[in-house]
Amino acid sequence: LQDPCSNCPAGTFCDNNRNQICSPCPPNSFSSAGGQRTCDICRQCKGVFRTRKECSSTSNAECDCTPGFHCLGAGCSMCEQDCKQGQELTKKGCKDCCFGTFNDQKRGICRPWTNCSLDGKSVLVNGTKERDVVCGPSPADLSPGASSVTPPAPAREPGHSPQ
């Protein structure tokens, strides 16, 4: 025999107290799949969290962080303070990157500038605490009259690498 609860759609639960009929999820709860015997309590976005997507009868609320903070962890389980570009977050707050390191994001750590010579290239543009060094072509890549060429294997990410 088919389980009568399997007919209960998302947004409802199979109510054992009412002959296993499908009852709507109570306020502030949801069921994202059919055949559920209970509804889950909606996540509440409080304090440094703010609501990005309201809870519905079929899906949980989604949180992000208030301005000045960014999400960490699966499903934005934590909020961490932003820093300025060229800084990193320490136990004592945001601190400027040391010479020879950079951070082009509002989160993460300061990372050492790229060492162009490891790839046989020269420094095309010096680094700063906000930006990485740009490596130029190796001498063999330069053709007469060319002011520059894209490094055959240039840098890494969008303005930075992820943390």
């Epitope: 570009q85 082009d104 790839d119 894209t150 840098a155 890494r156 969008p158 303005g159």
Partner: antibody
Framework: EVQLLESGGGLVQPGGSLRLSCAAS????????MSWVRQAPGKCLEWVSV????????YYADSVKGRFTISRDNSKNTLYLQMNSLRAEDTAVYYC????????????????????WGQGTLVTVSS | QSVLTQPPSASGTPGRRVTISCSGS????????VTWYQQLPGTAPKLLIY???HRPSGVPDRFSGSKSGTSASLAISGLRSEDEADYYC???????????FGCGTKLTVL
Amino acid sequence: EVQLLESGGGLVQPGGSLRLSCAASGFTFSGYDMSWVRQAPGKCLEWVSVIYPDDGNTYYADSVKGRFTISRDNSKNTLYLQMNSLRAEDTAVYYCAKHGGQKPTTKSSSAYGMDGWGQGTLVTVSS
Amino acid sequence: QSVLTQPPSASGTPGRRVTISCSGSSSNIGNNYVTWYQQLPGTAPKLLIYADSHRPSGVPDRFSGSKSGTSASLAISGLRSEDEADYYCATWDYSLSGYVFGCGTKLTVL
């Protein structure tokens, strides 16, 4: 020669889903950041998302955050974009783009721009 | 509305020089590298300038980029009919944690 070939575009109803793919060849796919960039008919270029090759870290434009998911399979040299809860304003040509700057040679690819582009695949969201 | 501001159009006659501006803020252009792209009608964009002012191999030296403060410029000298295209500036924006493009400048060669 860098080659990027997008596929998976088509007509979809509002609220629907679509998965785009980008097959890459001619370079070491696993060493480069990859982005999706879109362009609505007659409109500007709009960056959508980027994924890094090492840790798989991802970033998204606010307009698609929570609806789109970028991923990559380095063993298949393929980039993906899963698009859910599609809206009319998502109608655009979607380009797959390779960033300059091979990891681990350098740490930041932003300086080098997007030096390889596919020809794009059209996504139309309409009822 | 784009975070980077470009004039919607520019024009010039063959052989002349034209400049396209791109204005931003300290969270993007001010502290990050600017790149420029050329998009010919009906084609995908092509990288024209990287790291503010450097040309990839194969890009003619008629194209040059510069940056000052929170603004960048693309200059095209010795204008040719084949330069007729849309030109986009782009950079990383740390406050948005994403790349940003200008809305493009349509260059017409008269």
